[in-house]
Amino acid sequence: TQHGIRLPLRSGLGGAPLGLRLPRETDEEPEEPGRRGSFVEMVDNLRGKSGQGYYVEMTVGSPPQTLNILVDTGSSNFAVGAAPHPFLHRYYQRQLSSTYRDLRKGVYVPYTQGKWEGELGTDLVSIPHGPNVTVRANIAAITESDKFFINGSNWEGILGLAYAEIARPDDSLEPFFDSLVKQTHVPNLFSLQLCGAGFPLNQSEVLASVGGSMIIGGIDHSLYTGSLWYTPIRREWYYEVIIVRVEINGQDLKMDCKEYNYDKSIVDSGTTNLRLPKKVFEAAVKSIKAASSTEKFPDGFWLGEQLVCWQAGTTPWNIFPVISLYLMGEVTNQSFRITILPQQYLRPVEDVATSQDDCYKFAISQSSTGTVMGAVIMEGFYVVFDRARKRIGFAVSACHVHDEFRTAAVEGPFVTLDMEDCGYNIPQTDESTLMTGRA
């Protein structure tokens, strides 16, 4: 099919088409009151796309100022544009908020490329398509930035959903989600369904389309199929997990599993690509090239730089392999695997050739800071950030793009020994010197 089948975002909600649904497995965990079921008001509350990030609407201040905020599980600051910028349609105007409190403290966040800096304060914050609560949260008012805001992305700030340990300027600055849980009865859990379109969206299409769902405080059954499988959060800073095995089309990469997690593996909605440590990236690309050898592509494509185009509807998905990441399970010596399709790791790009072509960038790239399971991975799955139980759950997303032959999968259990040895122990240095490089 032209762009692969895109499953509907929901079944029977708000008049959405029923479309194709994968059969639900029956061996699910028992219901947990208040944490599972239907969260209709939060379904479809995200917009955006993998290349520029997914954002949720939030209000800040009194009277409320509405802003679109990037959902980022790879950082821990709530930071919003607070001064005019060429790429911002609107920004937080602290002087107009009667509830703003200045913390009289600055914050500076450098990235590998770019940076932002601002002034810390607190204000009242709510999420219109979220829980019906208002919380006083720390806010970094961004006054200066470089290569941070994205032209045409339609978001004006960032919601860092990771833990206090990586908050800037230091771990004493309480992240938004911690404030939310402390001040309300919202359970300490959120879940994300990021929906890649499978084809490029222009600016107006992004604004009109659904990008997915952020369910705050629970799990919505309509957003996934099959079972949820959980992997432990190794350490509460980033959402760090442990990968124990990697396969390309079922072929084991056969590397020391420590390499997969060197120097960490994280789940990060604010990163576009699946990023892999240098050695792992090279082995993976070699294997993907071998699997797709009936066609050859230039080196620049494998570096994520050049676009490859095919006549519309003729993208040869079948020549590209599936990629499986095995994650440590909750039970000793037990793992499970998540499998993504080329429909996830070939990212559709705005048409730079002609409207008669479908063009893609290779969305797996090299990392010097460990594995980053970015949007291209997350777009295949419904991902549950169960902070209360220090675990992350994966299930097949009801909106993932696939074709008639293959689908993304979450499968287990598998027997895997010595999984603890797969984790890398970072030498203890001052964490504040870490660069937060993202791509």
Epitope: E295, K296, P298, G300, E305, Q306, A353
Partner: antibody, heavy 120, light 108 residues
């Protein structure tokens, strides 16, 4: 030293099919290091890419010519061919075959070209 | 579609002079750009690839520069055999498809 040589009729009638062959000598068309392509140049005008082929048979075509163009490869003869159907006077051009090298990116070796005139 | 605009259309210079040819892309093509030389009655010849790398056998007087949207081919001192038409081509979008309209370097 690898060389490319185009061959085929120099005159084709309107609405008929233009057929050209490129013979590769001094090297193998089955090399995994190259794609092979066709480019044309109307008299006094610029260059227009027609399409590419890999020895496995995988093809890419210029969107403006799709539906009319077919490129095929015969590894046993070390040749690849171009067919362009339903030709008009606008298809009159010098047709070049070329090798796409430098990591499949650049046309680094060209045939001398053959002029094909479409006229009744 | 990425459009490559070459300027000037014609450049009239004398042997020994420096020639500067421009190629502008309608959107960024990174460094994925080539320059070709074509003499009358001959096939094009690859001069420069990846914006600045000289192809095999190309004299050092030819140099390429630029990235993103603006590229330059410079011939430091024109030799009689350099009078020809020069084309740029982008390969950021693959397979390579777009050529510029050409710049003719003629004897003044």
């Amino acid at each position: 030293q690898l060389q490319l040589q185009e061959s085929g009729p120099g005159l084709v009638k309107p609405s008929e099919t233009l057929s050209l062959t490129c013979t590769v000598s001094g090297g193998s068309i089955s090399s995994s290091s190259y794609y092979w392509g066709w480019i044309r140049q109307p008299p006094g005008k610029g260059l227009e890419w027609i399409g590419n082929i890999y020895y496995s048979g995988s093809t890419y075509y210029n969107p403006s010519l799709r539906g009319r163009v077919t490129i095929s490869v015969d590894t046993s003869k070390n040749q690849f061919s171009l067919k362009l159907s339903s030709v008009t006077a606008a298809d009159t051009a010098v047709y070049y075959c070329a090798r796409l090298g430098h990591g499949y990116n650049y046309f680094d070796l060209w045939g001398r070209g053959t002029l094909v005139t479409v006229s009744s | 579609e990425i459009v490559l605009t070459q300027s000037p259309a014609t450049l009239s210079l004398s042997p020994g002079e420096r020639a500067t040819l421009s190629c502008r892309a309608s959107q960024s093509v990174s460094s994925y750009l080539a320059w070709f030389q074509q003499k009358p009655g001959q096939a094009p010849r690859l001069l420069i690839y990846d914006a600045s790398n000289r192809a095999t056998g190309i004299p050092a007087r030819f140099s390429g520069s630029g990235s993103g949207t603006d590229f330059t081919l410079t011939i430091s001192s024109l030799e009689p055999e350099d009078f020809a038409v020069y084309y740029c081509q982008q390969v950021y979008v693959w397979p390579p498809r777009t050529f510029g309209g050409g710049t003719k370097v003629e004897i003044k």
